[in-house]
Interface confidence: medium
Amino acid sequence: LTCLGGFASPGPVPPSTALRELIEELVNITQNQKAPLCNGSMVWSINLTAGMYCAALESLINVSGCSAIEKTQRMLSGFCPHKVSAGQFSSLHVRDTKIEVAQFVKDLLLHLKKLFREGQFN
C-alpha cells in the first residue's frame, strides 16, 4: 500500500492518505446521490473484515456503465494486491445477500471511517 499511486500527485502515497481519499470519494458519492445510484443495481454484500478491499472491488466490478463509482473502483484496485475481474468471488462475499450499490457504499463508508479513526490504514 505504501506504493499506492495518488490521484492528486504522482509518486508513492501513504496508506493514510489513500484511505482518506477513498473515504472522501465515498462521501462524495453519498452526498451527490440524486437518482438511485447506478440505477439501483444490486451487488453481493461482503464481510467487512480482512481482505474486504478486494471483496468490495469484486462486488462493485460487476456493476458496469455506472460512472459514479468508476473512481471508487480504481481506488479499491489500489488497495487490492491481486487483479480483480468481473465474475470473480472470494469467500468474503455473503453470497445469499444482495444489496443496492447505494447501501453497499454507505456500509463500506461507515466501516472505513471506523478503521481511519482507529488508525488501521493497511
Epitope: F7, A8, S9, S16, T17, R20, E21, I23, E24, E25, V27, N28, T30, Q31, L109, L110, K113, F116, R117
Partner: antibody
C-alpha cells in the same frame, strides 16, 4: 503549536467583495480538509463551506452558494474564502476550522480566532 | 438537510452541580457528532468527538454518549470555568449543522 489565524475581515458595502485568508501552522496542512464557519452577532454557529485535502471535493451552505468560493494553497499552508455579492445577513465572525475527513471524522478539532466581516452601507 | 435540536436552550446551575444537555438529530447520524464549548468573544473549543470520545486536554468531568439520533453531554461537577454556551455539531452529511446551543449561567 497547532494554529489557525484568519485575516481579511472588515467593513464592506452590500454587493461588495472580500477575501478572507486562514494561515495554518504547526501541522501538515495538506493532510487535512478545511471548513469555514460563521457566527452572526449574538447568534449561533453556521457552517459555511468545506474543501477536501486536494481540492477534489467542495461543498457550500445554500445561503452562500453561488456567491462564496472556498480554495486552498497547500504550498502556502493557506485557506481562502472569496465572498462576492455580500449582503447584510453575511455580517458575522468567520472562523476557519480543521477537519480530518469531511463529513466523516472528528470535524472541527482546531479553530482560528475568527475575523469580523461587517456588511453595511 | 439534517436538523439539530438542543435542550434545554438555557439553564442556571451552581458550582458542583451535575448538568446534562441533550442534542437530537432529525435523522440517523451514527456517531458523527461533536460537542463544543464557547465563551463570549472566543472561538469554540471541542470537548467531545465521535459522540463519546474526550478531546485531549479536556477534563474528564465532561462526557458524551449516544448514537443515531439522540446524544447527551454531561458535566459531572460544574466548575466556574464551565459557564459558557454549548453547541452540538453533526458532521455526517452536508450541510453540516450545529444545534442552537445551550447557555449555562450561574444560579
Amino acid at each position: 503549536e497547532v494554529q489557525l489565524v484568519e485575516s481579511g475581515g472588515g467593513l464592506v458595502k452590500p454587493g461588495g467583495s472580500l477575501r478572507l485568508s486562514c494561515a495554518a501552522s504547526g501541522f501538515t496542512f495538506s493532510s487535512y480538509s478545511m471548513n469555514w464557519v460563521r457566527q452572526a452577532p449574538g447568534k449561533g454557529l453556521e457552517w459555511v463551506s468545506y474543501i477536501s485535502t486536494s481540492n477534489s471535493y467542495i461543498y457550500y451552505a445554500d445561503s452562500v452558494k453561488g456567491r462564496f468560493t472556498i480554495s486552498r494553497d497547500n504550498a502556502k499552508n493557506s485557506l481562502y474564502l472569496q465572498m462576492n455579492s455580500l449582503r447584510a445577513e453575511d455580517t458575522a465572525v468567520y472562523y476557519c476550522a480543521r477537519d480530518q475527513v469531511g463529513a466523516t471524522l472528528d470535524a472541527f478539532d482546531i479553530w482560528g480566532q475568527g475575523t469580523m466581516v461587517t456588511v453595511s452601507s | 438537510d439534517i436538523q439539530m435540536t438542543q435542550s434545554p436552550s438555557s439553564l442556571s446551575a451552581s458550582v458542583g452541580d451535575r448538568v446534562t444537555f441533550t442534542c437530537r438529530a432529525s435523522q440517523d447520524i451514527t456517531d458523527d457528532l461533536g460537542w463544543y464549548q464557547q465563551k463570549p468573544g472566543k472561538a469554540p473549543k471541542r470537548l467531545i468527538y465521535a459522540a463519546s470520545s474526550l478531546q485531549s486536554g479536556v477534563p474528564p468531568r465532561f462526557s458524551g454518549s449516544g448514537s443515531g439520533t439522540e446524544f447527551t453531554l454531561t458535566i459531572s461537577s460544574l466548575q466556574p470555568e464551565d459557564f459558557a454556551t454549548y453547541y452540538c455539531l453533526q458532521h455526517n452529511s452536508y450541510p453540516f449543522t450545529f444545534g442552537p446551543g445551550t447557555k449555562v449561567d450561574i444560579r
